[in-house]
């Protein structure tokens, strides 16, 4: 997360006293992991299995349709962001199992933990793009008929990815491996050394651009969309409302612990008790944020079953119907069922 937020449980009793006791050996290792770390490992394992398989399936389903179907372009990009993040999980899993020891080298330390941040920014920016698309479909249907095309969608996605990469750079640059003298261990973390102000700036930017600003804009955006669509008799559905709210909320719910602890740690001294307490929860917060990487396919399936009643259909077929159904822009005052349903499908990421 921020500075070197890893504790060293292997040599549990080696540094809890200030008197010499030459009869007590101090370098005997204990193999017990902390409860938050065990929970993190369980979450990582589930996220990896569901995330890799689910997102691979979504990529496979949407890739064929992405040339012509705009919704497929959105979901393809979201799935790619999630899939990439999931690929880093075995490494992060191994590191936690080894009490946060990082034997994978400096390059892996810079790249792999940065993937979850890239995912966060890519997802929220893609979510913002999708939300803008939903908004325009509802409030500017004529404009959409004239200009809403696959080319523009791909450009919007490219811009989102570019900005996400740009926002990930600070964490990438400050991420280094540190080898501790005792217990002998290599740690991977972010080191700002003398620059506490820069550390705080990065944490604040991450909180604002990756959380607070999107939360505000998406809340406003979806409030307007839901008010408009819900006021139409043809689209008045509590299911729609529930799914859209759940879909938008998931991003913020799962990122909240990471963001809160991140901002707190940037303002705390690394030797303070609160910092050390948050430290112990770091892996759990990261794993909780990682749930975003596997939640999308689950929501697509649940939404697909709930709206279209396609319980008897195969999973790829169900996903294809959910993810590639094109929003039809009518000049009439209400949307087609297809539009509302598609809008309700995870129009958010991670």
């Amino acid at each position: 997360m921020n500075s070197f937020n890893y504790t060293t449980p292997d040599y549990g009793h080696y540094d809890d006293k200030d008197t010499l006791d030459l009869n007590t050996p101090v370098d005997k290792t204990s193999n017990t992991l902390r409860v938050p770390d065990i929970l993190a490992l369980v979450i990582f394992a589930v996220v990896f299995l569901v995330g890799v398989l689910g997102n691979a399936l979504v990529v496979w389903v949407t890739a064929f349709e992405a040339k012509r179907t705009i919704n497929a372009i959105w979901f393809l990009n979201l799935a790619v962001a999630d899939f990439l993040s999931c690929l880093a999980l075995p490494i992060l899993f191994t590191s936690i199992v080894q009490h946060h020891h990082w034997p994978f080298g400096g390059a892996a330390c810079s790249i792999l933990p940065s993937l979850i941040l890239l995912n966060m920014y890519a997802s929220i920016l893609l979510l913002a793009t999708i939300s803008a698309d939903r908004f325009l479909l509802v409030f500017k249907p004529i404009w959409c008929q004239n200009f809403r095309g696959a080319g523009l969608a791909w450009i919007a996605c490219a811009v989102a990815w570019g900005l996400a990469l740009l926002l990930t750079i600070p964490s990438f640059l400050y991420r280094v491996v540190r080898e501790e003298y005792f217990p002998p261990k290599v740690l991977c973390g972010v080191d700002y050394s003398h620059d506490k102000r820069r550390e705080r700036a990065v944490a604040i930017v991450r909180l604002v651009l990756g959380f607070l600003w999107p939360l505000l804009t998406l809340t406003i955006c979806y409030t307007f969309i839901l008010l408009r669509t819900w006021s139409r008799r043809a689209t008045r559905s509590t299911k729609t409302l529930k799914v859209v709210v759940a879909v938008v909320a998931s991003f913020f719910i799962f990122w909240l612990p990471y963001q809160v602890t991140g901002i707190m740690m940037s303002f705390l001294e690394p030797s303070s008790p609160t910092f050390l307490l948050l430290n112990k929860l770091d892996s759990l917060c990261v794993s909780f944020a990682y749930i975003n990487c596997c939640i999308n396919p689950i929501i697509y399936v649940v939404a697909g079953q709930g709206f279209q009643g396609r319980l008897r259909k195969s999973l790829p077929s169900l996903l294809r119907n959910v993810l590639t159904e094109e929003s039809v822009v009518r000049e009439s005052k209400s949307f087609t069922r297809s539009t509302v349903d598609t809008m309700a499908q995870k129009t958010q990421a991670v």
Epitope: P25, H100, F182, N279
Partner: antibody
Framework: QVQLKQSGPGLVAPSQSLSITCTVS????????VDWVRQSPGKGLEWLGV???????KYNSALKSRLSISKDNSKSQVFLKMNSLQTDDTAMYYC?????????????WGQGTLVTVSA | DVVMTQTPLSLPVSLGNQASISCRSS???????????LHWYLQKPGQSPKLLIY???NRFSGVPDRFSGSGSGTDFTLKISRVEAEDLGIYFC?????????FGGGTKLEIK
């Protein structure tokens, strides 16, 4: 009472190897690590490496290829071996122990072995 | 490697006066367990270094209370409240948080 006593040659010819023995008393080598540090007028105090209680060694990366630390727990002895010595390896060589590891820094030091590399 | 920079190089002081030595590290020295492994040593001519202060501010056994250490993160200070003749020698700061442990260049405390 904790003590570290060093023994080894004072004069080494260039390209030859150096061997120093550190005999400890007052604690067990199976439980505690012993470090080697050298001090030269040009480089000041320089950490060479450590051998932990479980026998794991760690070396200063700049000297890793020429350095070897081993021990004999039963004799309470730790050995430093350094190959291919050059004139800039001329220094006072110390064995030291933190006992409670980095808790206390290097709390106990040997008396030092002055090594001169000269033809 | 962590570079330890000590200032001043030489510190002339009158007996009974206070002396202050600074040490700055190129990286934060906070260990992942929350401790900071920054130590101070005194080396008198012809002797091995002796540990004075461990973990920033803890006095090692037998060290008089006129010696005190302070600091955090990357900036540390050793203070001698009333310098005595036996305090003269070279003072080193050192870190053992990261591999390799590194030492400062030393500060020579001498009579003014």
């Amino acid at each position: 009472q904790v003590q570290l006593k060093q023994s080894g040659p004072g004069l080494v010819a260039p390209s030859q190897s150096l061997s120093i023995t550190c005999t400890v008393s007052g604690f067990s080598l199976t439980n505690y690590g012993v470090d080697w540090v050298r001090q030269s007028p040009g480089k000041g105090l320089e950490w060479l490496g450590v051998i932990w209680g479980d026998g794991i060694t760690k070396y200063n990366s700049a000297l890793k290829s020429r350095l070897s630390i081993s021990k004999d727990n039963s004799k309470s002895q730790v050995f430093l071996k350094m190959n291919s010595l050059q004139t800039d390896d001329t220094a006072m060589y110390y064995c030291a122990s933190a006992l409670d590891y980095s808790n206390y820094g290097f709390a106990y030091w040997g008396q030092g072995t002055l090594v001169t590399v000269s033809a | 490697d962590v570079v330890m920079t000590q200032t001043p190089l030489s510190l002339p002081v009158s007996l009974g006066n206070q002396a202050s030595i600074s040490c700055r590290s190129s990286q934060r020295l906070v260990h992942s367990n929350g401790n900071t492994y920054l130590h101070w040593y005194l080396q008198k001519p012809g002797q091995s270094p002796k540990l004075l202060i461990y973990k920033v501010f803890n006095r090692f056994s037998g060290v008089p209370d006129r010696f005190s250490g302070s600091g955090s993160g990357t900036d540390f200070t050793l203070k001698i409240s009333r310098v005595e003749a036996e305090d003269l020698g070279i003072y080193f700061c050192a870190q053992s948080t990261l591999v390799p442990p590194t030492f400062g260049g030393g500060t020579k405390l001498e009579i003014k």
